[in-house]
């Protein structure tokens, strides 16, 4: 069964900068990736970026740069303008769509104990169902 992993890390040099890494483990080529925060897109979450392998990327503040890392993984850099660093408690969700297989989605957040610069382990937070 395909899976999606989500990893959130705080930059060591700049505590207001965060990076979300997402990857798809499974067969099929990715047609679209949607990244949201505050929950899944369509379920109260806010869209941060949409990445298409051929047509490029579209992003919305506070997303700074969305890019493909491999054919099945992406990264999204975020700039936190607020002093209170709200990203630390935020859930980030990534949805990978593969045709004709379908979509897989998972969410993750920065672990409370994580030190700046240390990446969170890729442990997806299941939403609604374990295979979502």
């Amino acid at each position: 069964t395909p899976e999606v992993w989500v990893q959130v890390q705080m930059e060591a040099t700049e505590l207001s900068s965060f990076t979300v890494h997402c990857g798809f483990l499974g067969p099929g080529s990715i047609s679209l990736v949607t990244v949201s925060w505050g929950g899944p897109d369509g379920a109260g979450g806010t869209k941060l970026a949409v990445l298409h392998p051929e047509l490029g990327t579209r992003q919305w503040a506070p997303a700074r740069q969305a890019r493909w890392e491999t054919q099945s993984s992406i990264s999204l850099a975020l700039e936190d303008s607020g002093a209170s660093s709200p990203f630390a408690n935020t859930t980030f969700c990534c949805k990978f769509a593969s045709f004709p297989e379908g979509s897989w989605e998972s969410c993750g957040s920065l672990p409370p104990s994580s030190d700046p610069g240390l990446s969170a382990p890729p442990t997806p937070v299941p939403i609604l169902r374990a295979d979502l």
């Epitope: 080529s29 369509g42 379920a43 769509a97 004709p100 297989e101 379908g102 979509s103 169902r129």
Partner: antibody, heavy 120, light 107 residues
């Protein structure tokens, strides 16, 4: 204007074969996933077969696996459905449809359909 | 495969009425739901994608809502030209599956 025109349907004997074609125009055919959807006499819609833009992946409805083959010729802007060992339950109106990545793979354009009738 | 149960099968309404059609998925389909309109003698046409987004040229009297397993499609102020069969469809997991359709008739 996006246009999808199906052809190749007709009356065929039980166990016979047919090849449906769908001529696409008005868009970059090679960039889109395509599928064949049929509408049964009871007006139910079923996704019969689908193929992605780069021809890497295909999907078939369980009841047509091993009998139907979906293919595409991106140079000719044409989608095909080779149907063999036809059964009476394959009688339907067959549509070709385009899938839009940015619309969650919704089928944003459909052809007018071509009718397939399997008789005993 | 995911079953999309659409209700009601038939609707008889007067012009100006508000119409609601529901679709229930047998498992979560996220927000990957589309709605189609099929007028007599025509092929289906896309109305809504990602549950609530109207396709190009679709009037704003058509709206959609829901997430996960329960979805609603509404026509505010039905017009005579809305006479058609309406289908929901999930594109979350292969095989994409359709609801059984709702035939809308105008009194």
């Amino acid at each position: 204007d996006v246009k999808l025109v199906e052809s190749g349907g007709g009356l065929v004997k039980l166990g016979g074969s047919l090849k449906l074609s769908c001529a696409a125009s008005g868009f970059t055919f090679s960039s889109y996933h395509m599928s064949w959807v049929r509408q049964t006499p009871e007006k139910r819609l079923e996704l019969v077969a689908a193929i992605n833009s780069n021809v890497i992946s295909t999907y078939y409805l369980d009841t047509v696996k091993g009998r139907f083959t979906i293919s595409r010729d991106n140079a000719k802007n044409t989608l095909y459905l080779q149907m063999s060992s036809l059964k009476s339950e394959d009688t339907a109106l067959y549509y070709c449809a385009r899938h839009e990545d940015y619309y969650g793979f919704a089928m944003d354009y459909w052809g007018q359909g071509t009718s397939v009738t399997v008789s005993s | 495969s995911i079953v999309m149960t659409q209700t009601p099968k038939f609707l008889l309404v007067s012009a100006g009425d508000r119409v609601t059609i529901t679709c229930k998925a047998s498992q979560s389909v996220s927000n990957d739901v589309a709605w189609y309109q099929q007028k007599p003698g025509q092929s289906p046409k896309l109305l809504m994608y990602y549950v609530s987004n109207r396709f190009t040229g679709v009037p704003d009297r058509f709206t959609g809502s829901g997430y996960g397993t329960d979805f609603t499609f509404t026509i505010n102020t039905v017009q005579a030209e809305d006479l058609a069969v309406y289908f929901c469809q999930q594109a979350y997991r292969s095989p994409w599956t359709f609801g059984g359709g709702t035939k809308l008739e105008i009194k």
